[in-house]
């Protein structure tokens, strides 16, 4: 039960985390105009990974995409790559983890296969979370560097001609969304890895079988013992008459209304 809960919770936490990583990647507010200690402007600038936007006090907002690949800073390209890799790994991890969930029964998938899939998805979530955290952190570092550079040189020549007060940028909402989302995906991945340990079958090739003292009414069905050991794949033979041998795990193995999604 604890394993199922850990696995389910890990899946949900990772799902929220990946949704957050996608949201952060799409958000325009990775960097926002620094308003502190600046003249009050009627124009507010903010930038994302894909476009930069200007919101006027009139309420009009104009966004322009970065329609160049080669002209963009290498750091921005690296951040984009990290976020996309994070999303792709996370999406694959989600797909794998759906089939690995203990509460979902697909054909005759063995616990060992589910354990492997849980571990795979867990590792994918961890790497996905790390990619997101790394991407956001690289961007944040870039902002801090640029912020102090522009503070040291508040007036800069635009195109070498016009003297203009340089717009300084600070952390936008997307950075915080990205950090939290990356952290959640990482936590979800760790939970999946922990759940994998509980799902993995024992080292021995047979399970402990408990025999109950039985009276003359006991009738063993052919193949009944085989099913009771847990190695048989024929589920029709799995249920043994009361009083017969039963594995410790088999109590949970009967199909119930909760086994199908």
């Amino acid at each position: 039960m604890a394993v199922t809960a850990c696995q389910g919770l890990g899946f949900v936490v990772s799902l929220i985390g990946i949704a957050g990583i996608i949201a952060a990647t799409c958000m325009d507010q990775w960097s926002t105009q620094d308003l502190y200690n600046n003249p009050v402007t009627a124009v507010f600038n903010y930038q994302g990974l894909w476009r930069s936007c200007v919101r006027e006090s009139s309420g009009f907002t104009e966004c322009r995409g970065y329609f160049t690949l080669l002209g963009l800073p290498a750091m921005l390209q690296a951040v984009r790559a990290l976020m996309i890799v994070g999303i792709v790994l996370g999406a694959i991890g989600l797909l794998v983890s759906i089939f690995a969930l203990k509460c979902i029964r697909i054909g005759s998938m063995e616990d060992s296969a589910k354990a492997n899939m849980t571990l795979t998805s867990g590792i994918m979530f961890i790497v996905s979370g790390l990619c997101a955290i790394a991407g956001v952190s690289v961007f944040a570092n870039m902002l801090v560097t640029n912020f102090w550079m522009s503070t040291a040189n508040m007036y800069t020549g635009m195109g070498g001609m016009v003297q203009t007060v340089q717009t300084r940028y600070t952390f936008g909402a997307a950075l915080f969304v990205g950090w939290v989302a990356g952290g959640l995906t990482l936590i979800g991945g760790v939970m999946m890895c922990i759940a994998c340990r509980g799902l993995a079958p024992e080292e021995t090739n047979y399970k402990a079988v408990s025999y109950h003292a039985s009276g003359h009414s006991v009738a063993y069905k052919p193949g009944g013992f085989k099913a009771s050991t847990g190695f048989g794949s024929n589920t029709k033979n799995k249920k043994i008459y009361d009083g017969g041998a039963r594995t410790e795990d088999e109590v949970q193995s009967y199909p119930s209304k909760h086994d199908y999604v």
Partner: antibody, heavy 118, light 113 residues
């Protein structure tokens, strides 16, 4: 057709108060930032107050800060300017205007005259 | 506050003549985010409120004749009327639309000879 109609102007003694109103029609008032601009007898233009579409932002120059209050009622499509502690230098024609692209004032009312004199 | 300086204060012209008036701001009105200059030009005729002519330093408001042209960047801006008509006689104001308070110039009065 866009229309802005100011009212509430008049003669007031120094230190007195006055509330100007502006009735808007012909555009989406609730989505527009609005401003009050005054024109002195010497024909100089001065922005006295600005309010954002969602009431979240208001701005006043130092000359009127603490004395003037801009507000809006989106349900009534109305803009207001509460003026208190009026001075003789507040004598002007007060215009209500809508902010458009580039923060430019694209529509103006006909103005209402305010005279501060003892 | 941003100081807007307009020159000349008045211009006497003849119909059909080309007219140029300038506006200087004490700080750059160029926004690095969209590379637009937040400078606006208005026309005010006697007994009327100001009328928007040009915003973003060079974008004509709809309905404004194409004889009106705005140019300039940063701190120096120009309004040009390619061929003055009788109905163009008015006072022209420039406005800083970038920094609060959104300040106006003192105006340039266009008069007929």
């Amino acid at each position: 057709e866009v229309m802005l109609v100011e009212s509430g102007g008049g003669l007031v003694k120094p230190g007195g108060s006055l509330k100007l109103s502006c009735a808007a029609s012909g555009f989406s008032f609730s989505n527009s930032a609005m401003s009050w601009v005054r024109q002195t007898p010497e024909k100089r233009l001065e922005g006295v107050a600005t309010i954002s579409s969602g009431d979240s932002f208001t701005y006043y120059p130092d000359t009127v800060k603490g004395r003037f209050t801009i507000s809006r009622d989106n349900a009534k499509n109305s803009l207001y300017l509460q003026m208190s502690r009026l001075r003789s230098e507040d004598t002007a024609v007060y215009y209500c205007a809508r902010q458009g692209y580039g923060n430019a004032l694209d529509y103006w009312g006909q103005g209402t005259s305010v005279t501060v004199s003892s | 506050d941003i100081v807007m300086t307009q020159s000349p204060s008045s211009l006497t012209v003849t119909a059909g003549e080309k007219v140029t008036m300038t506006c200087k701001s004490s700080q750059s009105l160029l926004n690095s985010g969209n590379q637009k200059n937040y400078l606006t030009w208005y026309q005010q005729k006697p007994g009327q409120p100001p009328k928007l002519l040009i915003y973003w330093s060079s974008t004509r408001e709809s309905g404004v004749p194409d004889r009106f042209t705005g140019s300039g960047s940063g701190t120096d801006f120009t309004l040009t009327i390619s061929s003055v008509q009788a109905e163009d006689l008015a006072v022209y104001y420039c406005q800083n639309d970038y920094y609060y308070p959104l300040t106006f110039g003192a105006g340039t009065k266009l008069e007929l000879k």
